[in-house]
Interface confidence: medium
């Protein structure tokens, strides 16, 4: 007997081919021998089965002598053996109908769990193989779960169903709501306009929820709620902002802040969170900012970083074109009594440059005494 | 050898009717399907109707099922395309056909022009 | 219905190999085979059956004509093209009803 998987929701077609390369009478009946559909002449006649709604042929192919059942909107129930009865001869095709969903929305938030659940006739005993969009291989029976979903995880898992030696392929598509960086650092000199950008990693039609941007200075004793806003089908409006900083925020996706200058005060770290309309949980994304000043007082030329720095960033001095005159793997470096000339202040990480200041530094001219 | 000759055509005023035939040689009239086919002038071609000869049952397209009814004559092995209630737009080169191996038309009748005006 | 789109017109100089497109709306595949023909059509003649289930000569057709099919798409193409083949082409589904022709592609020999 041959056997046919199908896959719930889609459409089958079971065939059935005579020798005669001519239209003659066909029944397709089931294991209880309830016509399902014949013919009459050219005519397509249809028996009492419940699949009558959904059961049709191909009459342009019956003259080639091919008599097709086709079952759509497949149902699990509408497994059975079928038989074909064309030319004295009997037919019988198994049909298996399979169903693979998500048990929870498709639409998942980072480190949520994914679970896959298998829709299958009894008496099958089928396997199930699911491949990630990175790759990642999980097998299981009527279940499969994957715990702490990454981004890397959204995309198109493709499952195969293994029964009686056949397959059956689905594919389900994840979206895991996550914003695209984990972490970001900004460098800035004291002064600058800094603009923090908070990009997703998905695209949904409608995107309504509400976040808050909370800040821990580092010359602060507690983090302070810098701004809260709404989000409605990706409009953004601001609830409610801090006097000091003043942030102004973007209109529309991506999330974005501007914090109108860069001082020594506001270095830090904050947490951007965000909470979508039904999810539990919320998306969440860490910024850095590391603020740099030069400063010349008196016979002190001072080199200075405020944020949060790894320990291997190095810190120096230099005369434009020479080699530095100082180099520390600390926050702050000096100069006394500094030729003149274009100083820069660089901060690095293994020679690549993350931040520059210049500081102009004049010559010192011994004043006349006046007669 | 196979052979469809058609005959039947002419011209004639909307709303009247007018019977295409199509007559047969070199193969079994019961074993095949034949169907009809027509192009209007300067267009494309587009199916019309096919018969089974056998049970004698048609299957029309249902731009022309109310209108156009296929009967046929054994003994003679002829075909008939009968055209009522005849429109402007059914102007053209009406054709019948035979399937050859697969399920292509392989072998065609001269053509029948029928006008309608 | 499942329609057929073809481009309106084709050329090429005698000798060179013309390619003319049929997209299907929808598959025309069943059980392994392919629905789909194509004819050629002379000013005032019936067609003629060149190539059946997509890649198939029909007999007595000259080998330089042949059929191919990729997805929905099908293929006529002419290999050393002939004066003769001055024509009206057309693709055809059979794979379900109705059967349906593709909208024609006339070719002309430069």
């Known amino acids: 007997k041959k056997v046919v998987l199908g896959k719930k929701g889609d459409t089958v077609e079971l065939t059935c081919t005579a020798s005669q390369k001519k239209s003659i009478q066909f029944h397709w009946k089931n294991s209880n021998q309830i016509k399902i559909l014949g013919n009459q002449g050219s005519f397509l006649t249809k028996g009492p089965s419940k699949l009558n709604d959904r059961a049709d042929s191909r009459r342009s192919l019956w003259d080639q002598g091919n008599f097709p059942l086709i079952i759509k909107n497949l149902k699990i129930e509408d497994s059975d053996t079928y038989i074909c009865e064309v030319e004295d001869q009997k037919e019988e095709v198994q049909l298996l109908v399979f169903g693979l969903t998500a048990n929870s929305d498709t639409h998942l938030l980072q480190g949520q769990s994914l679970t896959l659940t298998l829709e299958s006739p009894p008496g099958s005993s089928p396997s199930v193989q699911c491949r990630s969009p990175r790759g990642k291989n999980i097998q299981g029976g009527k279940t499969l779960s994957v715990s702490q979903l990454e981004l890397q995880d959204s995309g198109t898992w493709t499952c195969t169903v293994l029964q009686n030696q056949k397959k059956v392929e689905f594919k389900i598509d994840i979206v895991v709501l996550a914003f695209q960086k984990a972490s970001s650092i900004v460098y800035k000199k004291e002064g600058e306009q800094v603009e923090f950008s908070f990009p997703l990693a998905f695209t949904v039609e409608k995107l309504t929820g509400s976040g808050e941007l909370w800040w821990q200075a580092e010359r602060a004793s507690s983090s302070k709620s810098w701004i809260t806003f709404d989000l409605k089908n990706k409009e953004v409006s601001v609830k409610r902002v801090t006097q000091d900083p003043k942030l102004q925020m973007g209109k529309k996706l991506p999330l974005h802040l501007t914090l109108p200058q860069a001082l020594p005060q506001y270095a830090g770290s904050g947490n951007l969170t965000l909470a979508l309309e039904a999810k539990t949980g919320k998306l969440h994304q860490e910024v850095n900012l590391v603020v740099m000043r030069a400063t010349q007082l008196q016979k002190n030329l001072t080199c200075e970083v405020w944020g949060p720095t790894s320990p291997k960033l190095m810190l120096s001095l230099k005369l434009e074109n020479k080699e530095a005159k100082v180099s520390k793997r600390e926050k702050a470096v000096w100069v006394l009594n500094p030729e003149a000339g274009m100083w820069q202040c660089l901060l690095s990480d293994s020679g690549q440059v993350l931040l520059e200041s210049n500081i102009k530094v004049l010559p010192t001219w011994s004043t006349p005494v006046q007669p | 050898e196979v052979q469809l000759v058609q005959s039947g055509g002419g011209v004639v005023q909307p709303g009247r009717s007018l019977r295409l035939s199509c007559s047969s040689s070199g193969f079994i009239f019961s074993d095949y399907v034949i169907n009809w086919v027509r192009q209007a002038p300067g267009k494309g071609l587009e199916w019309v109707a096919e018969?089974?000869?056998?049970?004698?049952?048609?299957y029309y397209n249902e731009k022309f099922k109310d209108r156009f009814t296929i009967s046929r004559n054994d003994s003679k092995n002829t075909l008939f395309l009968q055209m009522d209630s005849l429109r402007p737009e059914d102007t053209g080169v009406y054709f019948c056909?035979?399937?050859?191996?697969?399920?292509?038309?392989?072998?065609w009748g001269q053509g029948t022009p029928v006008t309608v005006s | 219905e499942s329609v057929l789109t073809q481009p309106p017109s084709a050329s090429g100089t005698p000798g060179q190999r013309v390619t003319i497109s049929c997209k299907a709306s929808q598959s025309v595949d069943y059980d392994g085979d392919s629905y789909m023909n194509w004819y050629q059509q002379l000013p005032g003649m019936a067609p003629k059956l060149l190539i059946y289930?997509?890649?198939n000569l029909e007999s007595g057709v000259p080998t330089r004509f042949s059929g191919s099919k990729s997805g929905t798409s099908a293929s006529l193409a002419i290999s050393g093209l002939e004066a003769e083949d001055e024509s009206d082409y057309y693709c055809?589904?059979?794979?379900?009803?109705?059967?349906?022709f593709g909208t024609g592609t006339k070719v002309t020999v430069l």
């Open positions: 018969t089974y000869t056998g049970s004698g049952s048609s």
């Open positions: 056909a035979r399937r050859g191996k697969g399920t292509g038309f392989a072998f």
């Open positions: 055809q589904q059979s794979y379900e009803d109705p059967p349906t």
């Open positions: 289930a997509a890649s």
